[in-house]
């Protein structure tokens, strides 16, 4: 579905097997590993590309304090199971029978348990925060033309509209870029925060997703942004429940 | 069937306002974003600005400096486009249109409100 | 804000024939291309959109192709009902989403 037509690849996939077996002898590619069908005009979701990376051969100048129910993804990578619409599983499950839930993003947000662990429903991480810390430079970035470059990055790159860029935040070398989408705010064709995050994620440590595309070349007014590290938090719409021991 | 049914033609004196109204049906109004477009006699088609009806965010050309206000009423599915300040070269016909948030693609067009602006 | 320059500004043809409409934009837009069609004293209408994809609906006689910058609609028989006006539009970037100035193609 809307992949390129003259060579028949996914511009926005390369871990995709494309062919021109579509409607009318159009490209249609399908995601490694699941073998959906993706629309390659916009973002792939990210457990479809966790499920595909498994299966492949190996405003205020003050920064965001993130909330005590805010997730880090310390768990790394697993096979997930995603649903007909791509999206993942409320509850994932690895081959030892080990059962856990998971937000929208496919981040852990329960203790570990067994096949009897329920999950209701699937909770939506509604604010992520992406903080990253820059190389240094001959001088601070300029804030607005930061604040400028990311949106239109977000918006040119990830085709996330520029609404759902909350704010970018900036005390050098340390920027912070929040991206805040409740579900009642997604409107057709919108891209979900956190497809963007996991794509930026794996531009900023190159490796991109994209197609025949150059790595990120960030720059504000010429200037090279290089990132040196990157921590993503996760905050749900409802919080996390966790036993204490955990936060012991 | 998707609908988009505007108010009908205004005549307007330079400076004053004008708003027009795009009542949707057949759709879920508050899943898809809402445009505004206009296109002077003659002339090309121009972007004016969106709304997401669900939230009521916004966003404008800036060639209308401030002029231009979109807003909503989710209770009756209509849209609306406010002019102020109105000058001759404001003379158009102003269409609101559906829009799709990847592809920024209008899919379904209103019919189109002439508005007159002539002392 | 990315300027879109369509020609040419009007052709003619006769029925039966193959029409190509460029358009040209003034950085790289990807594939965010969309063609419409506008008839006198009516609404535009979506023929295309991310550059190929026929809206539905849209005979298939119309395609449209290009990437980066540079971009076609191509008609490949023209009917009676094609004669109008035809506008190229991006929707790549941050807002203003533009149009091309138009291409009117008259009846030979």
């Known amino acids: 579905h809307t992949a390129a037509q003259d060579n028949c690849t996914c511009p926005t996939n390369k871990m995709t097997v494309c062919s021109p077996d579509g409607p009318g002898g159009r490209c249609q590619c399908r995601a490694l590993g699941s073998g959906m069908a993706v629309d390659c005009s916009t973002l792939t979701s990210k457990c479809l590309l966790l499920k595909a990376r498994m299966s492949a051969p190996k405003n205020a100048r003050t920064l965001v304090r993130p909330s005590e129910h805010a997730l880090v993804d310390n768990d790394g990578l697993y096979d997930p199971d995603c649903d007909p619409e791509g999206r993942f599983k409320a509850r994932q499950c690895n081959q030892t029978s080990v059962c856990w839930c998971v937000n929208s993003v496919g981040v852990r947000r329960t203790d570990k348990g067994d096949l009897s662990l329920r999950c209701d429903e699937l909770v939506r991480t509604h604010h992520i925060l992406i903080d990253l810390r820059h190389r240094p430079t001959a001088g601070a970035f300029n804030h607005s033309d930061l604040d400028a470059e990311l949106r239109r990055l977000f918006r040119e790159r990830y085709r996330l509209h520029p609404k759902f860029v909350a704010a970018v935040h900036y005390e050098q070398p340390t920027i912070q870029i929040e991206l805040r989408q409740n579900t009642s705010q997604k409107a057709a064709g919108d891209v979900d925060i956190g497809d963007a995050a996991y794509y930026f994620e794996r531009d900023i440590k190159g490796e991109s997703l994209f197609q025949g595309r150059g790595g990120l070349d960030l720059r504000v007014r010429g200037e090279p942004l290089q990132v040196e590290r990157t921590l993503i938090y996760y905050l749900d719409e409802i919080p996390p429940k966790f036993s204490m021991k955990r936060l012991t | 069937q998707v609908q988009l049914v505007q108010s009908g033609a205004e005549v307007k004196k330079p400076g004053a306002s004008v708003k027009v109204s795009c009542k949707a049906s057949g759709y879920t109004f508050t899943s898809y974003w809402m445009h505004w477009v206009r296109q002077a006699p003659g002339q090309g088609l121009e972007w004016m600005g969106e709304i997401t009806p669900s939230d009521g965010y916004t966003s404008y050309n800036q060639k209308f400096k401030g002029r231009v206000t979109i807003t909503r009423d989710t209770s009756t599915s209509t849209a609306y486009m406010e002019l102020s300040s109105l000058r001759s070269e404001d003379t158009a016909v102003y269409y609101c249109?559906?829009?799709?948030?990847?592809?920024?693609?209008?899919?379904?067009w209103g019919q189109g409100t002439l508005v007159t602006v002539s002392s | 804000d990315i300027q879109m320059t369509q020609s040419p500004s009007s052709l003619s043809a006769s029925v039966g024939d193959r029409v190509t409409i460029t358009c040209r934009a003034s950085?790289?837009?990807?594939?965010?291309l969309n063609w419409y069609q506008q008839k006198p004293g009516k609404a535009p209408k979506l023929l295309i959109y991310?550059?190929?994809s026929l809206h539905s609906g849209v005979p298939s006689r119309f395609s449209g192709s290009g990437s980066g910058t540079d971009f076609t609609l191509t008609i490949s028989s023209l009917q009676p009902e094609d004669f109008a006006t035809y506008f190229c539009q991006q929707g790549y970037t941050l807002p203003p989403y533009t149009f091309g100035q138009g291409t009117k193609l008259e009846i030979k």
């Open positions: 950085q790289d837009i990807s594939n965010y």
């Open positions: 249109a559906r829009g799709h948030g990847n592809y920024v693609s209008f899919d379904y």
């Open positions: 991310y550059t190929s």
